[in-house]
Interface confidence: medium
């Protein structure tokens, strides 16, 4: 796994697709639908918590139309998640035994229908803007979670949220090293797939502690970091240390070597 030492880390491809148009929804802005599992366990969010989780990570809970558009663009995820209408669904392109749901062996978005708000699932979020820049930070000894928080703060930034990383990925951020995010997770964005970087599809990879794709990394373990600097704090070109101009896309990779 890129950028990792422990042999107990496992990655999920977490393929994410850009949604650019939805049939019957011509005004849907371009954006990214992504599966989100905050915290260490699967299926832990009530409907209200699911909405809050998306907001907390810089996104909103996805609509059925957005998930359908993502599915039609090739998005697949064998995890049930809340959507904005309080239904629980998941998109399956290649049906297989554990992921059949209500559609037998046919491809499609599986649905559990409207579920009681107290039941717990994962969530599908949608993010369509990045109001600032995400940058990759590292140093020789890398960072514990707290060190990453403090390092980003010392560079007039905060640790990036998962939603911000997905938004940056959709704008071209590609880094084959896992980095801390604000929710304590470890992820890395891949635009151009290559064998050493966790799969043959573009997407944001998530590093889990256990092979069943649960568990957060030990906060004292050392990794790289992804920081986020909001628009109001983004320096104009040439202001950043070393005079490196800010990328027009709002995405840049700063390799910080100061200790």
């Amino acid at each position: 796994t890129p950028g990792l030492g422990p042999a107990t880390a496992f990655t999920s491809e977490d393929l994410v697709v850009q949604v650019t148009a939805v049939p019957g929804q011509p005004h849907l802005p371009g954006g990214v639908v992504f599966h989100y599992r905050p915290g260490p366990t699967r299926y832990s969010l009530t409907f209200e918590e699911a909405q809050q989780a998306c907001l907390r990570t810089g996104a909103v809970i996805a609509s059925p139309e957005q998930l359908q558009a993502a599915y039609e663009a090739g998005y697949e995820q064998c995890d049930a998640g809340w959507l904005r209408d309080q239904t629980v669904r998941y998109p399956i392109v290649s049906p297989r035994t554990p992921c059949v749901g209500d559609k037998d062996s046919s491809p499609g978005v599986r649905t559990y229908g409207v579920r009681p708000s107290t039941e717990t699932y994962d969530v599908y979020c949608f993010v369509d803007r990045l109001e600032g820049e995400v940058f990759f930070a590292t140093r020789l000894e890398q960072f514990t979670f707290q060190e990453a928080l403090e390092f980003c703060e010392s560079h007039n930034a905060t640790l990036a949220t998962t939603g911000q990383l997905y938004a940056a990925w959709s704008r071209g951020l590609d880094k084959c090293y896992a980095g801390w995010l604000a929710d304590g997770s470890l992820r890395y964005p891949i635009v151009t797939p290559r064998p050493a970087c966790g799969g043959d599809k573009p997407g944001v990879r998530t590093v889990y502690l256990y092979p069943n794709q649960t568990g957060l990394p030990d906060p004292l373990s050392r990794h790289h970091a992804f920081c986020f600097r909001g628009i109001s704090a983004v320096p104009s070109p040439g202001e950043e240390e070393g005079g490196t101009p800010t990328s027009p896309s709002g995405v840049e990779e700063w390799i910080v070597t100061q200790v």
């Epitope: 915290g39 918590e49 809050q52 928080l149 403090e150 640790l159 929710d183 304590g184």
Partner: nanobody
Framework: DVQLVESGGGLVQPGGSLRLSCVAS????????MGWFRQAPGKEREFVAA????????YYADSVKGRFTISRDNSKNTVYLQMNSLRPEDTAVYYC????????????????WGQGTLVTVSS
């Protein structure tokens, strides 16, 4: 919105212990990172400790590491700060804070604040 109410402060001798509690209103308590800050007379408010919404991660100011422990009970909408081996320099008003993400040590990045509870360490 989230309302935060701290309790548990008081007068304690050096080397003693106190446990602060912060109760949050609202059903979405478990969606927030929670933190403790403190402000001594004539000084700026400073970060003490924080905990992520799932309790998966805790982090501390260097000055309290090994002496203070932050924890939370989402079923009770409560976050705790267990303070051991207290020192005179720990004297301050302690504030509970909430944020949508664990945003670190800058107090301006936290969304909600309690009114504070006074801790005095003196013999």
């Amino acid at each position: 919105d989230v309302q935060l109410v701290e309790s548990g402060g008081g007068l304690v001798q050096p080397g003693g212990s106190l446990r602060l509690s912060c109760v949050a209103s609202g059903r979405t308590f478990s969606s927030y990172a929670m933190g403790w800050f403190r402000q001594a007379p004539g000084k700026e408010r400073e970060f003490v400790a924080a905990i992520t919404w799932s309790s998966a991660t805790t982090y501390y100011a260097d000055s309290v590491k090994g002496r203070f422990t932050i924890s939370r009970d989402n079923s009770k909408n409560t976050v705790y700060l267990q303070m051991n081996s207290l020192r005179p320099e720990d004297t301050a008003v302690y504030y509970c804070a909430a944020a949508r993400i664990p945003v670190g040590r800058r107090s301006e990045n936290w969304d909600y604040w309690g009114q504070g509870t006074l801790v005095t360490v003196s013999s």
